[in-house]
């Protein structure tokens, strides 16, 4: 029986979440990131879609840019030039990947508030960006870097050899883009513009993947992309350095791989640039437990890059990969060579350790059984950071200052008793010096955006609190939310359970486990959402649990490594058990648990259907991953290694989908993938559809022609609602 | 007022070992990354070690790793160099120092005690 | 990292200018600091970072340099200013010491 919701007059004038609420995105709230022009001014995309400067310290604030301006080229962004003459307009935005886009680029003059006439830019535009200093323009088009001193100037073509789907320079191809850089782009400015970074990918001899999209002509288009899945040829990368003052001069300069990288296949895995004649850049092995930051020194005389032996610095694991998700970036110190980076300390934690001569002697700055999460700035007398050490609650997130221009430094909780019970997990933004930041505050109360001075930590204003959120939300039984821990087998086991609005620990509901689980994730977060799952417990008296197992991340490497050549075990052993410890609390009604998850929870969620524990009646994979010989190298052989016999076939052959095709006979299986899926191919679920046919197993599929691996437009509609009419049949809930 | 004042020095045989002492007053000793220098008769300076405040990090200079052993104590405000199987070349005056944290993480030498002599000789 | 230290002594007269230079066998990024030793005292901290004085440290006295090569300036010399002269640097540990420099009155 369906608990009943209604329990008094007053809860009788609220209403329960629709599913209507949630494809509207009724419920959806605002953040606000400054986008900071100096030390105390910023920029901001007002109501009415003007561009208007503020200035902290004036309190006053001016349009640069009308709305009319922005409507005249139709642009849906913008971006000042450092010497604040010119704006680029970008209009016609047209997607591509995860974070690459095409546009057209229109430039316009704030001197005599006209667009720039003559030598314009080309269409469509891969990427575009101002250099740090001045108006330089550096953009890629066609595959090609160009180069413009001023944007009415003629371009300078600095590569020539760019082809589609073969070289890419200064963006990257698709899986640097999506497993390395996350990044639509592959080019650095040096911090006074002096110099341009910018990487070569060739994937000349990577395999294609071939999809068709269907469109509206008589025949499909096949979509070609050169995506090296685990174990097949990878891209090779080169890094160039050119001198944007006088390009035509030595051209661009190749910097050296260190010799302990180049010794096998590699990966380059980011550039930071330290002043303009200092650069460094990190390296990766194939096998990807071994880092290799190298400083790179500019040598007047011989005007190429020098890349000393004694500034190169090995980051190794030896208990799993190398990094988190990414391998951390360093933050430089204002002495121009020692540097703040995040990475395991003995105990098997991430902190922050201040680097100068060798890793071996590196300050530890921070520590504990919590891990530092990213470094926002530093300088002369701050170090900021954000962490989850308050409270000990991985799923939380609080912002920190260290004096580090004193001893010992002492250190500050910045954000730990602003708003305790609303805000618990904060990024921040910075403004040049850390004069003045950003909170940005995003649960698990409603979210909410604040402007701080960098020396006192005062607050000045509120950015954004989200009002008319909060005011919508006054009629709505909400569900409840409740963030805990089970202790198995020592290992913590956090989870977010979502429970109806007026639950009664004496009844029975039925259960939706929601997974992810994939390699250094976290699902179990203090954030506000109003959304699917939300619904799913608010309308029909469902209860949602998230469960953080093996395998995820910011609880130490114990929990992130275990899975390390092993994906598809403990990750579906530990949703599995939580299950259990579900059940035995009382309220779980037994028959009635469902298990659904999206990508890497796709996977989760398919191995735990066909686990034969019999816990699970249903269960939906969305664009699920079924053997991880069909994923991409960068991101698969991160945790699995190679797809050889001397290496980790065994387990790649192993931990299929399709090797279980027998045990989804006693569950209820619902299988979803976009036909156009770049990521995820639509290849992973034909497979185990084919399987469970050849097994004779029956099961329920959607495909979403032409769509990628979001589901995104009407799709979204479509795929909740059918999703949300597969779990209410499963537990017998009436439409 | 700052002052470092080194004692414990003087005549020991070939193979034997000493105890220096550094007593500290006039500034915050336990914050203060501290160090031994010493000067042969009619030579230059030469490193021998550093200790940073709370004794989790010594570090020395390579050829004198096994002999000597530095160590602090907070509460009595007292640094300590141990020396051990010393021979004729460790005939020197024994400087203790400390000084001022440097941002980003090191520190200069800028007070110096007068020094103590250490003469080896059978 | 060896610290070689140029000249090991000269002879100047009050009111001269003089220059010591010091080597690093590898870059030392600045990590450099100063030092004077007057006969029979302790020595004192003049410069750190490379070029930034100490406390007290009259503007007379001025350090530069980059990578390897350090140099320690004193303009218009002071008769106080004759005694023994030390470059160490503070990259990685041993934090060694260059041979010296003896100034002496002529």
């Known amino acids: 029986l369906r608990p009943s919701r209604v329990h008094n007059s007053e809860e009788n004038t609220m209403r329960a979440l629709t599913l209507k609420d949630i494809l509207n995105g009724t419920f959806s709230y605002k953040t606000f990131f400054p986008n900071w022009i100096s030390g105390q001014e910023y920029l901001h995309q007002s109501a009415d879609n003007n561009i208007v400067l503020y200035n902290i310290e004036t309190g006053q604030s001016y349009t640069i840019l009308s709305n009319r301006t922005m409507k005249s080229v139709n642009a849906s962004n913008y971006g000042l030039s450092p010497d604040r003459q010119f704006v680029y307009l970008e209009s016609d935005y047209s997607k591509l990947w995860r974070y690459s886009y095409t546009a057209t680029y229109y430039i316009y003059d704030l001197s005599n508030g006209e667009f720039v006439r003559g030598n314009e830019l080309p269409r469509p535009i891969q990427y575009l960006c101002w250099s740090p200093v001045g108006s330089k323009l550096a953009y890629v088009y066609q595959n090609n870097i160009y180069l413009k001193q001023r944007p009415g100037d003629p371009p300078f073509q600095i590569t020539f050899n760019g082809r589609e789907n073969k070289i890419f320079n200064g963006i990257p191809d698709w899986v640097y883009e999506e497993e390395m850089l996350a990044t639509k782009y592959a080019l650095w400015w040096s911090p006074n513009g002096k110099f341009l970074a910018y990487a070569e990918f060739n994937d000349t001899d990577i395999p294609v993947i071939a999809y068709s999209y269907y469109g509206d002509e008589q025949y499909p288009r096949t979509i070609n992309i050169p995506y090296p899945k685990a174990g097949a040829k990878n891209p090779v990368v080169r890094i160039f350095i050119i001198d944007t003052t006088y390009p035509a001069y030595v051209g661009p300069q190749e910097v050296p791989v260190p010799a302990m990288i180049a010794s096998s296949d590699y990966y380059f895995s980011w550039l930071t640039w330290v002043t303009d004649e200092r650069v460094c850049l990190q390296w990766l092995k194939r096998v990807q437990n071994v880092s290799v930051l190298s400083i790179c020194d500019f040598r007047e005389d011989w005007q190429t890059w020098d890349c000393p032996k004694t500034q190169e610095h090995i980051e190794e694991s030896r208990t799993g990969w190398a990094g988190g998700f990414f391998v951390s970036t360093p933050v430089f110190s204002y002495d121009a060579i020692s540097y703040y980076k995040i990475f395991s300390d003995k105990d098997g934690y991430k902190h922050i350790h201040y680097i100068k001569d060798t890793v071996e002697n590196a300050i530890q700055i921070t520590s504990g059984k919590w891990e530092a999460i990213n470094i926002f700035r530093v300088t002369q007398d701050s170090l900021f950071y954000s962490s989850n050490e308050f409270e000990e609650y991985p799923g939380r997130r609080n912002i920190y200052r260290i004096s580090i221009g004193s001893y010992p430094p002492s250190k500050k909780c910045v954000t730990c008793h602003l708003r305790k019970e609303r805000c618990q997990y904060y990024t921040a933004s910075f403004s040049d010096y850390a004069k003045y930041y950003a909170l940005v505050c995003y649960g698990p109360g409603i979210p909410i955006s604040t402007l701080h001075d960098g020396r006192t930590d005062q607050e000045i204003k509120i950015l954004e609190e989200n009002k008319e959120l909060e005011n919508a939300l006054k009629n709505i039984q909400l569900p409840k939310e409740e963030i805990k821990k089970l202790e198995v087998d020592e290992i913590t086991l956090w989870y977010k359970m979502i429970l109806p609005p007026q639950f009664d620990r004496s009844k029975k509901y039925p259960l939706l486990i929601q997974v992810y689980g994939g390699p250094c994730s976290q699902s179990v977060r203090s954030v506000f959402a109003v959304n699917w799952i939300s619904y799913l417990a608010s309308k029909e008296g469902m209860v949602i649990a998230l469960v953080d197992g093996r395998g995820t991340a910011f609880q130490g490497d114990k929990l992130l490594y275990a899975v390390y050549r092993k994906l598809g075990v403990y990750e579906v052993e530990d949703q599995i058990t939580a299950v259990r410890k579900f059940i035995e609390m009382g309220f779980i009604d037994e028959k009635r648990i469902a298990i659904w998850g999206w990508s890497y929870g796709g996977y989760v969620s398919s191995l735990a259907l066909a686990s034969g524990t019999g816990l699970f009646k249903c269960g939906i994979a969305v664009a699920p991953v079924s053997s991880w010989e069909y994923y991409a190298s960068v991101y698969t052989e991160r945790f699995m290694g190679l797809p050889t016999k001397d290496d980790n076939l065994e387990h790649y052959k192993n931990s299929t989908v399709m090797a279980r095709a027998e045990y989804f006979r006693n569950v209820d299986y619902l299988l979803i993938h976009g036909t156009a899926d770049d990521n995820v191919h639509f290849q992973n679920s034909a497979q185990i559809a084919k399987a469970l046919v050849n097994a004779q197993v029956d099961f329920q599929a959607m495909w979403y022609s032409d769509q990628n691996h979001g589901l995104s437009g009407l799709s979204t509609n479509h795929l909740y609602t059918h999703m949300t009419h597969f779990l209410k049949q499963c537990f017998s809930l009436s439409d | 007022e700052v002052q470092l004042l080194e004692s414990g020095g003087g005549l020991v045989q070939p193979g034997g070992s000493l105890k220096l002492s550094c007593a500290a007053s006039g500034f915050d000793f336990s914050t203060y990354w501290m160090s031994w220098v010493r000067q042969a008769p009619g030579k230059g300076l030469e490193w021998i070690g550093e200790?940073?405040?709370?004794?989790?990090?010594?570090n020395y200079t390579p050829s004198l790793k096994d002999k000597f052993i530095i160590s602090r104590d907070n509460a009595k405000n007292t640094l300590y160099l141990q020396m051990t199987k010393v021979r004729s070349e460790d005939t020197a005056l024994y400087y203790c120092?400390?000084?001022?944290?440097?941002?980003?993480?090191?520190?200069?030498?800028?007070?110096w005690g007068q020094g103590t002599t250490v003469t080896v000789s059978s | 990292l060896q610290m070689t230290q140029s000249p090991a002594s000269l002879s100047a007269s009050v009111g001269e200018t003089v220059t010591i230079t010091c080597r690093a066998s590898g870059n030392i990024h600045n990590y450099l600091a100063w030092y004077q030793q007057k006969q029979g005292k302790s020595p004192q901290l003049l410069v750190y970072?490379?070029?930034t004085l100490a406390d007290g440290v009259p503007s007379r006295f001025s350090g530069s340099g980059s990578g390897t090569q350090y140099s320690l300036k004193i303009n218009s010399l002071q008769p106080e200013d004759f005694g023994s002269y030390y470059c160490?640097?503070?990259?990685?540990?041993?934090?060694?010491f260059g041979g010296g420099t003896k100034l002496e009155i002529k």
């Open positions: 120092a400390g000084g001022y944290y440097r941002y980003p993480y090191y520190y200069t030498m800028d007070y």
């Open positions: 970072n490379a070029k």
């Open positions: 200790i940073n405040p709370d004794s989790s990090t010594v």
């Open positions: 160490q640097h503070f990259w990685s540990t041993p934090y060694t």
